[in-house]
C-alpha cells in the first residue's frame, strides 16, 4: 500500500483515507457505504448476503 499522492492503488483497489491504505473494491459488495468505494469504478455492487 502507498501513501496518497504517490502511485495510485493497484487495479481493483481504492485508497481509504479512513484506514490509510488501499482497500479491495470487491469488499464494496459487503460494505457499499465504505468511503473508498466511491473510488471504485466497478459496476454497482450486487445485493449482499444479509
Amino acid at each position: 500500500e502507498q501513501a496518497p499522492g504517490t502511485a495510485p492503488c493497484s487495479r481493483g483497489s481504492s485508497w481509504s483515507a479512513d484506514l490509510d491504505k488501499c482497500m479491495d473494491c470487491a469488499s464494496c459488495r459487503a460494505r457499499p457505504h465504505s468511503e473508498f468505494c466511491l473510488g471504485c469504478a466497478a459496476a454497482p455492487p450486487a445485493p449482499f448476503r444479509l
Partner: antibody, heavy 119, light 111 residues
C-alpha cells in the same frame, strides 16, 4: 505490527461455560469485522461467529450449530472482543482462532487457543 | 450452506515442480466482476495464513510462485515452482454468504 492476542480456553465439563478473549493491536480495530473460527480433526476449519463494526450496527451472525449457545461481543474502546460459550458439548472441542476481516477474507489471525470439553 | 469440495486431499510434488489444488463450490460464488473465493496456507501449530483473495489477487508479501484462478464454482490454486517451505495444508474459503465455509484442506508434501 498487527497482533491478535488470545486468552481463555482449557478444559471444561460438558454443559459448562467458557469465555474467550482477543486483544487487537496494529490496525484500526473499530473499522473491522471480527470473527471466531474453530478447527477440529472431525470438522476441519469452521467459521463460528462474526460481529460487525459500529457502522454496521454491531450486527452479529452465528453458525447454526452454535446459535443460542455462543455470544460474540466487542469493546472498541479497548480493541478487544469476546466469545461467551455456554452449554458446551464434546463437539465444541477444538482450537479456537480469533480473526479480523474487513468484509470477506480472514486477514489477521490470533495464535489459537485450545478448548476441550470432556468429563 | 455452500459446500466447498477440495481435491486432492493430499498431494506429493517434487521440488521445483507444479502443485495444483482444486476447489469446487456447490453454487456460484462469483459476480460478473469478482469471485468471493480465498486461499490459505496452514503449517502445523500455526493459524492459517492468507495467500490469495478474490480468487486471483495475491496477498501482499506472498511469493509470486502462488497463483489463483477460476470463477463461478471451480477454482484452482497453483504453486510453481514448489519449495520445501511450501509443505503445509491449503484451504479454500468462500465469502459469498453466511455461513462462510472452508474446504476440507489439501495436504502438500514436497518430494
Amino acid at each position: 505490527q498487527v497482533q491478535l492476542q488470545q486468552s481463555g480456553g482449557g478444559l471444561v465439563q460438558p454443559g459448562g461455560s467458557m469465555k474467550l478473549s482477543c486483544i487487537a493491536s496494529g490496525f484500526t480495530f473499530s473499522s473491522y469485522w471480527m470473527s471466531w473460527v474453530r478447527q477440529s480433526p472431525e470438522k476441519g476449519l469452521e467459521w463460528v461467529a462474526e460481529i460487525r463494526s459500529k457502522s454496521d450496527n454491531y450486527a452479529t451472525h452465528y453458525a447454526e450449530s452454535v446459535k443460542g449457545k455462543f455470544t460474540i461481543s466487542r469493546d472498541d474502546s479497548k480493541s478487544r472482543f469476546f466469545l461467551q460459550m455456554n452449554n458446551l458439548r464434546a463437539e465444541d472441542t477444538g482450537i479456537y482462532y480469533c480473526s479480523s476481516t474487513y468484509a470477506d477474507y480472514f486477514h489477521y489471525w490470533g495464535q489459537g487457543t485450545d478448548l476441550t470439553v470432556s468429563s | 450452506d455452500i459446500v466447498m469440495t477440495q481435491t486432492p486431499a493430499s498431494l506429493a510434488v517434487s521440488l521445483g515442480q507444479r502443485a495444483t489444488i482444486s476447489c469446487r463450490a456447490s453454487q456460484s460464488v462469483s459476480t460478473s466482476t469478482y469471485s468471493y473465493m480465498h486461499w490459505y496456507q496452514q503449517k502445523p501449530g500455526q493459524p492459517p495464513k492468507l495467500l490469495i483473495k478474490y480468487a486471483s489477487s495475491l496477498e501482499s508479501g506472498v511469493p509470486a510462485r502462488f497463483s489463483g484462478s477460476g470463477s463461478g464454482t471451480d477454482f484452482t490454486l497453483n504453486i510453481h515452482p514448489v519449495e520445501e517451505d511450501d509443505t503445509a495444508t491449503y484451504y479454500c474459503q468462500h465469502s459469498w454468504e453466511i455461513p462462510y465455509t472452508f474446504g476440507g484442506g489439501t495436504k502438500l508434501e514436497i518430494k
